[in-house]
């Protein structure tokens, strides 16, 4: 039985040229995380593997930084970065949990940031 849930930063907005932290947290399960994939629509952004550590996709290397924790930092944001982002937690023994975050990148200098999510 998959009892876990993924908490995410939800819908967030950020300013063009700025940076944002994408964060997910798996709770309510004893399952152990073996890998986390970060995807934008169908594009793989980054992987954090229990054995191998972080791997950032070559096309995002300049603008994506690993962490904090299992999260992901997007830098030098453009309007084209607007869209859905997914954290995919591969766990033992439950299997796969997926969280969704919607990011809106605003041209305006008055971007309202959602409440920053902190992993306890």
């Amino acid at each position: 039985m998959m009892t876990g849930t993924i908490e995410t930063t939800g819908n967030i907005s950020a300013e063009k040229g700025g940076s944002i932290i994408l964060q997910c947290h798996l709770s309510s399960t004893t399952a152990q995380v073996t890998q986390v994939n970060w995807e934008q629509q169908d594009q793989l952004l980054a992987i954090c593997n229990a054995d191998l550590g972080w791997h950032i996709s070559p096309s995002f290397k300049d603008r994506v930084a690993p962490g904090p924790g299992l999260g992901l930092t997007l830098q030098s944001l453009t309007v084209n970065d607007t869209g859905e982002y997914f954290c995919i937690y591969h766990t033992y023994p439950d299997g796969t949990y997926t969280g969704r975050i919607f990011l809106e990148v605003l041209e305006s200098s008055v971007a309202e940031h959602g409440a920053r999510f902190q992993i306890p």
Partner: antibody, heavy 121, light 112 residues
Framework: QVQLVQSGSELKKPGASVKVSCKAS????????MNWVRQAPGQGLEWMGW????????TYADDFKGRFVFSLDTSVSTAYLQISSLKAEDTAVYYC??????????????WGQGTLVTVSS | DVVMTQSPLSLPVTLGQPASISCRSS???????????LEWFQQRPGQSPRVLIY???DRFSGVPDRFSGSGSGTDFTLKISRVEAEDVGVYYC?????????FGRGTKLEIK
Amino acid sequence: QVQLVQSGSELKKPGASVKVSCKASGYTFTNYGMNWVRQAPGQGLEWMGWINTYTGEPTYADDFKGRFVFSLDTSVSTAYLQISSLKAEDTAVYYCARAPPYGYDVRFAYWGQGTLVTVSS
Amino acid sequence: DVVMTQSPLSLPVTLGQPASISCRSSQSIVHSNGNTYLEWFQQRPGQSPRVLIYKVSDRFSGVPDRFSGSGSGTDFTLKISRVEAEDVGVYYCFQGSHVPWTFGRGTKLEIK
């Protein structure tokens, strides 16, 4: 390479306690869950439960709740199985078995060599 | 608990001949995540078990291709295309979909 080395055979009297160890090497201990499996003499295999080596949280099969305790010492990459109030029917080989790396949806990827616990007066 | 019933319990086979072991679960073993965690283990005399097949039909790393798994629903089969001397031992089916995870009683394969 991944290795799980268990402690040696134990002979115990009924009512006593025993602590079996499973020392891991060849990987980061806290990355992968550890299972415990029992095999009574001439019998089949029974899954006892597992412990999350990152959080230390154990999960026990119903038949192994109460007298059986899973624990860890992450500083020495070791998982432990403690059995209290031993009974003759606890006589068995006890195995530790590690969770798999990412990409393999198996329950037990690597096994220790087993520890024989004999309970006899 | 899910009961895993194996047959036969003893299987004498001639070297080079095929062998087949059947396993039936008392209920569906499809996990809530959609996977079927049906595995086959080999335990050679005096050794620890090792996984041969997982998720019904996937061969584990290093397992010879003479071993294959099949099945669905509640009926599953392990086949050895040509039995070799090193295949002697006890074979267990196992379900890891529903807690408590459970094993079959085992099938002892011996050379005729």
